[in-house]
């Protein structure tokens, strides 16, 4: 039975250019976290894994970094960037849990940050 | 037991679709992503995309774009694929894979196969 | 899209012998890698994951180990059953890929 919820930074803006964190934490649940997986759309941009540790994707590794935590900082941001991002968590015995972030790439120097909310 | 039962073999003429169906059983359906793989006839794999069952986010190889459409009925723990506009190019054996969503080890349990051949 | 390099395309071998496969990723791969065993009716299971993690059920004879980029599945001593097809599988980066196989014949 999955009881757990993640808790994600919710939709986000930052400037380009500039840098963001991406972050999720799952709540709820004494389920053992074995991998984060971090994709965005048709990429998988990086995995944590609890024995192998981080790996960044080839295609971003100049521009991702890992954490902090489980989290993912994406640098040197362009408006590209822009889309939704998935954090998705393989716990045991629970399975997986999936949380969505959107983040907006914008031009001028008025990027804020929005609300934080739940995905069950 | 963690069980992922296709449906049968398809013979379908050029230019039409086909669905293939996966029913899981053994384990919480929600719980662990299903993606799909062909093996062309001469035993090559490739990995056409993945689905989430909870709530429906999927990814696509850039190959198989407008080419496959994954979806999952909730009710009877099935996930689906229909392939669009076959050609014999399409003509293979596409297996449902659990993506192991407990210890993150990737594919771990894989459906039966169901063969798919095209030809008028 | 990374590419996974694997050698032997084919292996004849006999019982008891010990035999090993390659694959070579093309990037870096972090060991994200699977081991796959197909027999002839279609059937295909995963042996290994993470590189080297035995699957449960899976006999000891079969292990798996990295060197760099280098990827190998050894068969410490060859069974009947053990005659089939493999496969490796990088789960690092979408696409995922698979090595071309490795087709092992008894001798």
């Known amino acids: 039975m999955m009881t757990g919820t993640i808790e994600t930074t919710g939709n986000i803006s930052a400037e380009k250019g500039g840098s963001i964190i991406l972050q999720c934490h799952l709540s709820s649940t004494t389920a053992q976290v074995t991998q984060v997986n971090w994709e965005q759309q048709d990429q998988l941009l990086a995995i944590c894994n609890a024995d192998l540790g981080w790996h960044i994707s080839p295609s971003f590794k100049d521009r991702v970094a890992p954490g902090p935590g489980l989290g993912l900082t994406l640098q040197s941001l362009t408006v590209n960037d822009t889309g939704e991002y998935f954090c998705i968590y393989h716990t045991y015995p629970d399975g997986t849990y999936t949380g969505r972030i959107f983040l907006e790439v914008l031009e001028s120097s008025v990027a804020e940050h929005g609300a934080r909310f739940q995905i069950p | 037991e963690v069980q992922l039962q296709q449906s049968g073999p398809e013979l379908v003429k050029p230019g039409a679709s086909v669905k293939i169906s996966c029913k899981a059983s053994g384990y919480s359906f929600t719980g662990s992503y299903i993606h799909w793989v062909k093996q062309n006839h001469v035993k090559t794999l490739e990995w056409i995309g993945r689905?989430?069952?909870?709530?429906?986010?999927?990814s696509y190889n850039q190959n198989f774009k407008g080419k496959a459409s994954l979806t999952v009925d909730l009710s009877s723990s099935t996930a689906y694929m229909e392939v669009h506009s076959l050609t014999s190019e399409d003509s293979a054996v596409y297996y449902c894979?659990?993506?192991?969503?407990?210890?993150?080890?990737?594919?771990?349990?894989w459906g039966q196969g169901t063969s798919v051949t095209v030809s008028s | 899209d990374i590419q996974m390099t694997q050698s032997p395309s084919s292996l004849s071998a006999s019982l008891g012998e010990r035999v090993s496969l390659t694959c070579r990723a093309s990037q870096e791969i972090s060991g994200y890698l699977s081991w796959l065993q197909q027999k002839p009716d279609g059937t295909i299971k995963r042996l290994i994951y993470a590189a080297s993690t035995l699957d449960s059920g899976v006999p000891k004879r079969f292990s798996g180990s990295r060197s760099g980029s280098d990827y190998s599945l050894t068969i410490s001593s060859l069974e009947s059953e053990d005659f089939a097809d493999y496969y490796c599988l990088q789960y690092a980066s979408y696409p995922y890929t698979f090595g071309g196989g490795t087709k092992l014949e008894i001798k």
């Open positions: 894979v659990r993506y192991d969503g407990y210890y993150g080890g990737a594919l771990d349990y």
């Open positions: 689905i989430n069952p909870h709530n429906g986010p999927t």
